[in-house]
């Protein structure tokens, strides 16, 4: 087992240098100190070490930092950031927007998404920000890596970033993620007024809740069905018809194609079925005339 | 290892106020990386969530418990703590607080402590 | 809310057995599932997260699967210090929410 091999006499480097090519495999496990690496971060992304090497050292240098790499060795990374896993960066504590920055120009192109996305949430959780800058050194990554967040990295994006996002970038998205960047979006877009706010705020309705869809029912916003259908059932659930009708506007006549669908259907299933029938639409599945809602889960016969 | 004590008095009476207060030691309240949540357990029945609050102080209350809750956090002291105003019997229960990590589960809890509601 | 339905809420087992434990989410939950094991008188204990990763220090019997709206934990080999009862619990959307649990007593 290589790990049990002494270093041979003469054959432990004082620095990172050419000659530590020629070691065979178990003498780089043997011999090389990671606090070393570590020192001479760039003379290992220097010289044409292989790739099985490089695992070597990057083995050593998670012995030598079992709790996660000092932020002064991760602003020295370089192109070896190539070789860290998403799992190894969620360890670090990095502080400096410059060292992200740094790290994600290395990652630009290699597939390492995940790894540029563990990077910025790890920031933000040293109390960084998602500044528009960090968001344009992410680059071509879709924002949905909002998603890959944790709720509580999401309270340091700040509200700016909302303007970025589009519909498609939160179809991953918890209903937790959604209600924070909501919050957040309605800081972002709080001076634009009339159908542009609305045109802004509809990707992050997700997030609404039942008393904010009431006030936005009070603006002729005339919402598509397609963001209906993005609206959390516990805040559908608690519009009236009336309100659902002012909500949608003309385009009220689409409930019918998802009258069977999640969240129409539950939204169908708490109405009376006298009010849907007001609407003409040949909806089905409100509560019967002459039954009463006693709990929401369960239907009682009026008596 | 991070590790939570709640603290309080263990009998309250019929619409008073239920003060709970919960230490954090080996870690600290104004990490990042945590939600701070107040979780309860009446006498042989299952869990309830009451709430959780964020280093920052922002907050997010269980619906029907809302009206009589608040949660707050001293980073000075590492606690945070739980009010619960207008007590009922149907209060009575073992209070927890515990630590939600990013994963979003809770993963250390405090031992609990019994909170009698009577007169 | 989304409500969270363990099933059954007890069984009888014996050492050595296989259990399995079902909760189901009233709506898609996607992976934000946990699981927690409680003995009388303590804490509940994290023993799965996110449907299917296991916690760190808990025996390599315990599994997790499932996604959207069903769930299982299985036992692989039911030990003596397993006789206790189980939760599951959402973390998709607020308030969190539990199952009612699934007691696993000694057959």
């Known amino acids: 087992d290589a790990e049990q091999k002494a270093c041979p006499p003469g054959k432990e480097p004082y620095k990172v240098d050419e000659d530590l090519i020629f070691y065979q495999n178990w003498e780089l496990e043997a011999c090389v100190d990671g606090t070393m690496l570590a020192r001479q971060m760039d003379l290992v992304n220097e010289i044409p070490f292989t790739y099985e090497q490089l695992s070597i050292f990057k083995h050593k240098l998670d012995k030598t930092y079992p709790q996660g790499y000092p932020e002064s060795l991760i602003q020295q990374l370089g192109h070896f950031f190539r070789y860290v896993s998403p799992e190894d960066i969620h360890q670090w504590n990095v502080t400096s927007p410059d060292t992200v920055k740094t790290l994600l120009k290395v990652s630009k192109g290699q597939k390492m998404n995940a790894q540029a996305i563990a990077l910025v949430a790890c920031y933000l959780r040293g109390g960084g920000q998602l500044d528009e800058d960090m968001v344009k050194a992410l680059g071509d990554i879709p924002l949905s890596y909002l998603c890959d967040f944790s709720p509580q990295d999401l309270h340091s994006v700040p509200s700016s970033v909302m303007w970025l996002v589009g519909p498609q970038d939160l179809d991953k998205c918890s209903q937790r993620h959604l209600g924070l960047l909501y919050q957040k979006a309605c800081s972002a877009f709080q001076n634009v007024s009339g159908l542009e706010y609305f045109e802004k705020i509809k990707t992050f309705l997700g997030g609404a809740s039942v008393k904010d869809l009431r006030a936005l029912s009070q603006h002729n916003v005339s919402m598509d069905i397609a963001t209906f259908k993005r609206l959390q059932v516990d805040s559908l659930v608690g519009l009236s018809v009336a309100e659902v009708q002012k909500l949608l506007g003309p385009n009220i006549v689409d409930l019918k194609t998802e009258e069977d669908k999640s969240p129409v259907r539950d939204w169908l299933f708490r109405q009376h079925q006298k009010d849907l029938d007001r609407l003409g639409l040949g909806l089905q599945g409100g509560i019967p005339n002459g039954y009463l809602v006693l709990d929401f889960n369960v239907r009682e016969a009026f008596s | 290892q991070v590790q939570l004590q709640e603290s309080g008095p263990g009998l309250v009476k019929p619409s008073e106020t239920l003060s709970l207060t919960c230490t954090v030691s080996?870690?600290?309240?104004?990490?990042?990386?945590?939600?701070w949540s107040w979780i309860r357990q009446p006498p042989g029945k299952g869990l309830e969530w009451i709430g959780y609050?964020?280093?920052?102080?922002?907050?997010n209350y269980n619906p029907s418990l809302k009206s009589r809750v608040t949660i707050s956090v001293d980073t000075s002291k590492n606690q945070f703590s739980l009010k619960l105003s207008s007590v009922t019997a149907a209060d009575t229960a073992v209070y927890y607080c515990?630590?939600?990590?990013?994963?979003?589960?809770?993963?250390?809890w405090g031992q609990g402590t019994m909170v009698t509601v009577s007169s | 809310d989304i409500q969270m339905t363990q099933s059954p809420s007890s069984l009888s087992a014996s050492v050595g057995d296989r259990v399995t434990i079902t909760c189901r989410a009233s709506?898609?939950?996607?992976?934000?599932l946990n699981w927690y094991q409680q003995k009388p008188g303590k804490a509940p204990k994290l023993l799965i997260y996110?449907?299917?990763s296991l916690q760190s220090g808990v025996p390599s019997g315990f599994s997790g699967s499932g996604s959207g709206t069903d769930f299982t934990l299985t036992i692989s080999s039911l030990q003596p210090e397993d006789f206790a009862t189980y939760y599951c619990?959402?973390?998709?959307?607020?308030?969190?929410?539990f199952g009612g649990g699934t007691k696993v007593e000694i057959k």
């Open positions: 515990a630590r939600e990590g990013k994963n979003g589960a809770f993963d250390i």
């Open positions: 080996g870690g600290s309240v104004s990490s990042g990386s945590y939600y």
């Open positions: 609050i964020y280093y920052s102080g922002s907050t």
């Open positions: 709506q898609s939950i996607s992976s934000y």
């Open positions: 996110a449907a299917s």
């Open positions: 619990q959402q973390s998709y959307s607020t308030p969190l929410t």
